[in-house]
């Protein structure tokens, strides 16, 4: 029986040219994680983290994707084309496959600075990464 829970970064926005953490976390299961796949909205693989072999970043993303923190990915030098869905797929034994979804919206710098739609009060942040000023969650 699959008892696990996947938590994700959720819906986030980030500034063009900046970076963002894509993160998933599997809990509530004793299953062993054998591999984590990271896919983009068009189903192309960004990276794979195999429990035995470690990380493999696909050539098309080598310059802009850094492994970690943890089993997550850091997407750098963001472009408007990076807007869209991202998926983490946890391959586990004996449970099987768990899948999490993240939606990233990349904003033009001026929009990111001034758009009220994504602004969260400075003491009301619900994200955590290396440059919190430029990353916002929206529901």
């Amino acid at each position: 029986m699959m008892t696990g829970t996947i938590e994700t970064t959720g819906n986030i926005s980030a500034k063009k040219g900046g970076s963002v953490i894509l993160q998933c976390h599997l809990s509530s299961t004793m299953a062993q994680v054998t591999q984590v796949n990271w896919e983009q909205h068009d189903h192309s693989l960004l990276a794979i983290r195999n429990a035995e072999l470690g990380w493999h970043i696909y050539p098309a993303f080598k310059d802009r994707v850094a492994p970690g923190p943890g089993l997550g990915l850091t997407l750098q030098s963001l472009t408007m084309n990076d807007t869209g869905e991202y998926f983490c797929t946890y391959h586990t034994y004996p449970d099987g496959t768990y899948r999490g979804r993240i939606f990233l919206e990349v904003l033009e710098s001026s929009v990111a600075e001034h758009s009220a739609r994504f602004q969260i009060p400075i003491e009301g942040r619900d994200y955590k990464d290396d440059d919190d000023k430029h990353h916002h969650h929206h529901h």
């Epitope: 976390h25 003491e123 929206h138």
Partner: antibody
Framework: EVQLVESGGGLVQPGRSLRLSCAAS????????LHWVRLGPGRGLEWVSR????????DYADSVKGRFTISRDNAKNSLYLQMNSLRTEDTALYYC????????????????WGQGTLVTVSS | DIVMTQSPLSLPVTPGEPASISCRSS???????????LDWYLQKPGQTPQLLIY???TRASGVPDRFSGSGSGTDFTLKISRVEAEDVGVFYC?????????FGQGTKLEIK
């Protein structure tokens, strides 16, 4: 096995300084944000400060802002709290705590706590 | 900042009887990933706090199934189906959605 061991507490006069340390082991230290939480006499748990996995994001409770400084050394798997201009109301048992989820999701709570180090501020 | 309000602050219970603690947040704890970030902690006398329940209703590893959590948005409840002597201590709810993190005032469970 995850372990968090605090040290550095003691008796100090008001206005003086103290530096707390927390030595961590048993998990990928540089993938998680860490916190300081305190338990004062006759009071409940009070959150003090948080530092992100790479020190890029730091937050403090209003009660300690401008007086306390949180830092970490990922090479040494260590967390610190520099406490300046101490007040009697800072008297408490100080715990370091590990976030439950790795960087990028949200605070998500604390799955492991240290045993605490006692800070007593008195003249 | 999010304010957490717990009730009751004191809870005398007879062993074997059920117990319930309420927790209310001043704003929604719903994250964009669909989860409500509400935790319950228990601090037993002379011990370090321990995580009991996270994401409103998920029991932490090793927590007995007599503990259960429920609720959504701003109203949450911790239930103990049958209180045991070892449950004595202070129960705290905490919002884990954002900083500054905030705890409820704590509910002291005592055995009658």
């Amino acid at each position: 096995e995850v372990q968090l061991v605090e040290s550095g507490g003691g008796l100090v006069q008001p206005g003086r300084s103290l530096r707390l340390s927390c030595a961590a082991s048993g998990f990928t230290f540089d993938a998680y944000a860490l916190h300081w939480v305190r338990l004062g006499p006759g009071r409940g748990l009070e959150w003090v400060s948080r530092i992100s996995w790479n020190s890029g994001s730091i937050d403090y409770a209003d009660s300690v802002k401008g007086r306390f400084t949180i830092s970490r050394d990922n090479a040494k798997n260590s967390l610190y709290l520099q406490m300046n201009s101490l007040r009697t109301e800072d008297t408490a048992l100080y715990y370091c705590a590990k976030e439950r989820t790795p960087a990028g999701i949200t605070v998500a709570g604390f799955d492991f706590w240290g045993q605490g180090t006692l800070v007593t501020v008195s003249s | 900042d999010i304010v957490m309000t717990q009730s009751p602050l004191s809870l005398p219970v007879t062993p074997g009887e059920p117990a319930s603690i309420s927790c209310r947040s001043s704003q929604s704890l719903l994250h964009s990933n669909g989860f409500n970030y509400l935790d319950w902690y228990l601090q037993k006398p002379g011990q370090t706090p321990q995580l009991l329940i996270y994401l409103v209703s998920t029991r932490a590893s090793g927590v007995p199934d007599r503990f259960s959590g429920s609720g959504s948005g701003t109203d949450f409840t911790l239930k103990i189906s049958r209180v045991e002597a070892e449950d004595v201590g202070v129960f705290y709810c905490m919002q884990a959605l954002q900083t500054p993190c905030s705890f409820g005032q704590g509910t002291k469970l005592e055995i009658k």
